[in-house]
Interface confidence: low
């Protein structure tokens, strides 16, 4: 289903994963960031939209067109895109076009995800970014350099903000011991807009008290804590924003009324069973990997919807019944 987002002069269509996201620009100067450098001898300008929006996993086009005073310049040129800040930010893309050539040969494309769509000979440095991630949410700056008979260069000062949206993804769900011999649960999710988190479980309604954690890197992380798990059973964390929802669960089982010895035996038995299972899995994998040359095609990323993590934890304490979280 197509979602259209107007961003001033920039209209971006966000399509299902794998499709292009096209950005159409209205070149009316008052709607764009138009940066002009003029003197009696020359006039440079760059036109970029203030913002482009696209969904994680999709592609986006960062538009950038320019004008320059060297009317028929046909010499060598270099097109550059930086991230973060103008002039000093790290380059994410660079290409060079030979004299008379309309094709810019790529010299740098960070992670192979950046491709020049525009033709620098036609004053277009528009860049396509593939497989967007939340970490790509930053400001980008285009730059062009002439290096033939004419030596000149110009770089966008304001840049274009790439706003990456993402459906929620639960990145961590865990159960930790509390000081009072109880247990607490933590759920951390990322998404943009930042998702709302809710806990549900035995003797709980929906606990919506989510605490936003500080941004780590460029992730949009939110954490919700369930301070006291008072009943055995399944506890589910749900993360939701305007783009979707994701769920993950932990299971809490405590051993009640058993002697210390039988509790230890139960736990050791469970651990032994799991160790055997693990050995079986490893043996099966080893058997499958026996051929020396095995082609392993790239696997597409898993869908984030309904992704579940199961926490396994046991606490040994003579004054408190032990607990374990087991996979179903």
């Amino acid at each position: 289903m197509e979602k259209s987002i107007w961003l001033l002069a920039c209209l971006a269509w966000v399509l299902p994963t794998g499709s292009f996201v096209r950005t159409k620009i209205d070149t009316t100067e008052n709607l764009l960031n138009t940066e002009v450098h003029s003197s009696p001898a020359q006039r440079w300008s760059m036109q970029v939209p203030p913002e482009v929006s696209a969904e994680a996993g999709d592609a986006a086009v960062l538009p950038c067109t320019f004008t320059h005073p060297h009317r028929h310049y046909d010499g060598p040129l270099t097109a550059i895109w930086r991230a973060g800040e103008p002039y000093a930010g790290p380059q994410v893309f660079r290409c060079a076009a030979a004299r008379g050539s309309e094709l810019c040969q790529t010299a740098l494309s960070l992670h192979g995800r950046f491709r020049l769509l525009g033709n620098p000979r036609r004053n277009d440095l528009s860049l396509r970014v593939e497989r967007l991630a939340l970490a790509d949410d930053r400001r980008y700056f285009c730059r062009v350099e002439f290096a033939g008979d004419v030596h000149d260069r110009y770089e966008s000062r304001h840049g274009v903000r790439l706003h990456v949206t993402a459906a929620p993804r639960i990145v961590n769900i865990s159960v930790l011991p509390s000081p009072a011999h109880a247990f607490r649960a933590l759920c951390t999710a990322e998404g943009e807009p930042p998702p709302a988190l809710a806990w549900s479980g035995p003797a709980l309604g929906n606990s919506l008290a989510a605490v936003r954690s500080p941004r780590e890197g460029h992730g949009h992380l939110v954490t919700a804590e369930l301070p006291a798990l008072t009943h055995d059973g399944r506890y589910t964390c749900t993360a939701a924003n305007s783009l979707g929802r994701s769920e993950a669960s932990v299971y809490l089982f405590r051993f009640h009324g058993a002697s210390g010895a039988s509790t230890v035996a139960l736990l050791l038995g469970a651990l032994g069973f799991k160790a055997l299972l693990l050995l079986g899995v490893l043996a099966a994998r080893a058997a499958r990997r026996r051929p020396e040359h095995l082609d392993t095609p790239d696997t597409p990323p898993r869908s984030q919807a309904q992704e579940s993590n199961y926490e396994n934890l046991s606490q040994m304490n003579p004054r408190s019944p032990p607990a374990t979280m087991c996979s179903p």
Epitope: F20, R22, A98, S101, L103, N119
Partner: antibody
Amino acid sequence: QVQLVQSGGGLVQPGRSLRLSCAASGFTFDDYAMHWVRQAPGKGLEWVSGISWNSGSIGYADSVKGRFTISRDNAKNSLYLQMNSLRAEDTALYYCAKGLWPSYDLDAFDIWGQGTMVTVSS
Amino acid sequence: QSALTQPASVSGSPGQSITLSCTGTSSDVGAYNFVSWYQQHPGTAPKLMIYEVSNRPSGVSDRFSGSKSGNTASLTISGLQAEDEADYYCSSYTSTIPPFVFGTGTKVTVL
């Protein structure tokens, strides 16, 4: 199923006009550049014209410039070639082809139509 | 603009490897890594076999491989099979207008 279905060819007198159509299905038409390539009987392939995904950039072979017009209707998933002032040397099998990228001036054509014959003769 | 130069015909026996050449100039093949190869059986539309010098589209046999040296691009067909008998055309992006140039074509015959 990804396919391009062509129509509109035929016999036409020199100086007259003809319009070729190409209906696309099975892929997101407005993500890609589209092209016309022709092949004269017993000859090789010749690129005729290309159009970017949003019609913002268009190119023609020198031999057809000023006489042929390429266009597309993304809402109808269709590509067109309006051929005016036809000449005997325009006689060929005309193919529509899908580009790999949104810009027409990138090079590879990964999906081809079945071809439609245009014969210019008096 | 001149077409890229290809040998008129190349032949080989089943199981053999053959190499088709495509010679251009420093304005096309020599300048850019945008060379494509197409296979055309009689009476059918061309099929993309290689793009950007050496990339194979999905569905194309790995017996087909592409390379480039200087102003000459090459298509190698290994383990030649009867169904490989067809016409082969190379194409390149070029800095001239129009931006595409095709080769003259090579007829491959499987003996």
